[in-house]
Amino acid sequence: VSITKCNSDMNGYCLHGQCIYLVDMSQNYCRCEVGYTGVRCEHFYL
C-alpha cells in the first residue's frame, strides 16, 4: 500500500493522531495515538 503525508489543509484533522494519505484507496486516514479511537481520533478510551 502506497502512503504519503496528508495535504497541509488536513493539519489538525486528526485530533490525537497522525494523518496519512492512502494513495491506492484515495483516502485520508487517522493513525491514532494509543488510547484514542474514532475517525478523527477524537474519542478516548481506557
Partner: antibody
C-alpha cells in the same frame, strides 16, 4: 447513501444577507470539513471558506473575510453559510462540499439572486 | 494564498485530437491537484484527484500528470461529449481553482 441537501433558491435585495443551509445525511459532519464554493453566471469556481464542525474552526478566503460566516450545527448535522452586505456581483450558485476522509462530495447547489 | 494559473482559457480542437491543459501553482502543492469537468447548467464533475488518480467511471482517455508547481491534464482523443469547461483545483493548502479552460469542437 451519503447526501448533502441544500436549501432552496433565494432572491435578495442589495445590502441584505442570505443564509444557505446544507444538511448532511448518511455521514456525520463531525468526521468532515464542509467547504463552500460559489459560481457566478458564466464565471469560474471560487472557494469561499470552510468549517471544521468538530473543532468549530473556520477558514475564509481573504476576499470574503468579514462578510461571510460559516457555521455548523452538529445536533442537526447541518452546515450554514451566511453572506452579508449583498451586491449584484454575489448573484451565483453556492455549493457546499464535503471533504475529509474521502475526496470532495458536492451538494446540489443553491441559486442566490441579488436584485433590486 | 496559493494562486493557480490555468492555460489556455479556451481552445478549439477536432474530434480525435489530443488536448492538453496546464495549471501552474505559485508554490509546491505536493501533487494535491484535482481536475473537474463542468457542462452548462450542471454541477462540476470530478475526473481526477491527487494529480493522476482517475475517478471510477471516468474514461481512460482522461489523464493527469505533474509534480511540484507544474501540472498537466490531457484528453488523449477528444470526443464530442468532452465539450465542457475544465478546472484545476489545488487542495494542498486550503483551496484554489484555476480560471477554467473552455473546450470546443472545431
Amino acid at each position: 447513501q451519503d447526501q448533502l441537501v441544500q436549501s432552496g433558491a433565494e432572491v435578495k435585495k442589495p445590502g441584505a444577507s442570505v443564509k444557505v443551509s446544507c444538511k448532511a445525511s448518511g455521514f456525520n459532519i463531525k468526521d468532515t470539513y464542509i467547504q463552500w464554493v460559489r459560481q457566478a453566471p458564466g464565471q469560474g469556481l471560487e472557494w469561499m471558506g470552510r468549517i471544521d464542525p468538530l473543532r468549530r474552526q473556520t477558514k475564509y478566503h481573504e476576499k470574503f473575510e468579514g462578510r461571510v460566516t460559516i457555521t455548523a450545527d452538529t445536533s442537526t448535522n447541518t452546515a450554514y453559510m451566511e453572506l452579508s452586505s449583498l451586491r449584484s456581483e454575489d448573484t451565483a450558485v453556492y455549493y457546499c462540499v464535503r471533504s475529509g476522509r474521502e475526496f470532495d462530495f458536492w451538494g446540489q447547489g443553491t441559486l442566490v439572486t441579488v436584485s433590486s | 494564498d496559493i494562486q493557480m494559473t490555468q492555460s489556455p482559457s479556451s481552445l478549439s480542437a477536432s474530434v480525435g485530437d489530443r488536448v492538453t491543459i496546464t495549471c501552474k501553482a505559485s508554490q509546491d502543492i505536493h501533487k494535491y491537484i484535482a481536475w473537474y469537468q463542468q457542462k452548462p447548467g450542471q454541477a462540476p464533475r470530478l475526473l481526477i484527484q491527487y494529480t493522476s488518480t482517475l475517478q471510477p467511471g471516468v474514461p481512460s482517455r482522461f489523464s493527469g500528470s505533474g509534480s511540484g508547481t507544474d501540472y498537466t491534464f490531457t484528453i488523449s482523443s477528444l470526443q464530442p461529449e468532452d465539450i465542457a469547461t475544465y478546472y484545476c483545483l489545488q487542495y494542498d493548502n486550503l483551496r484554489t481553482f484555476g480560471g477554467g479552460t473552455k473546450v470546443e469542437i472545431k
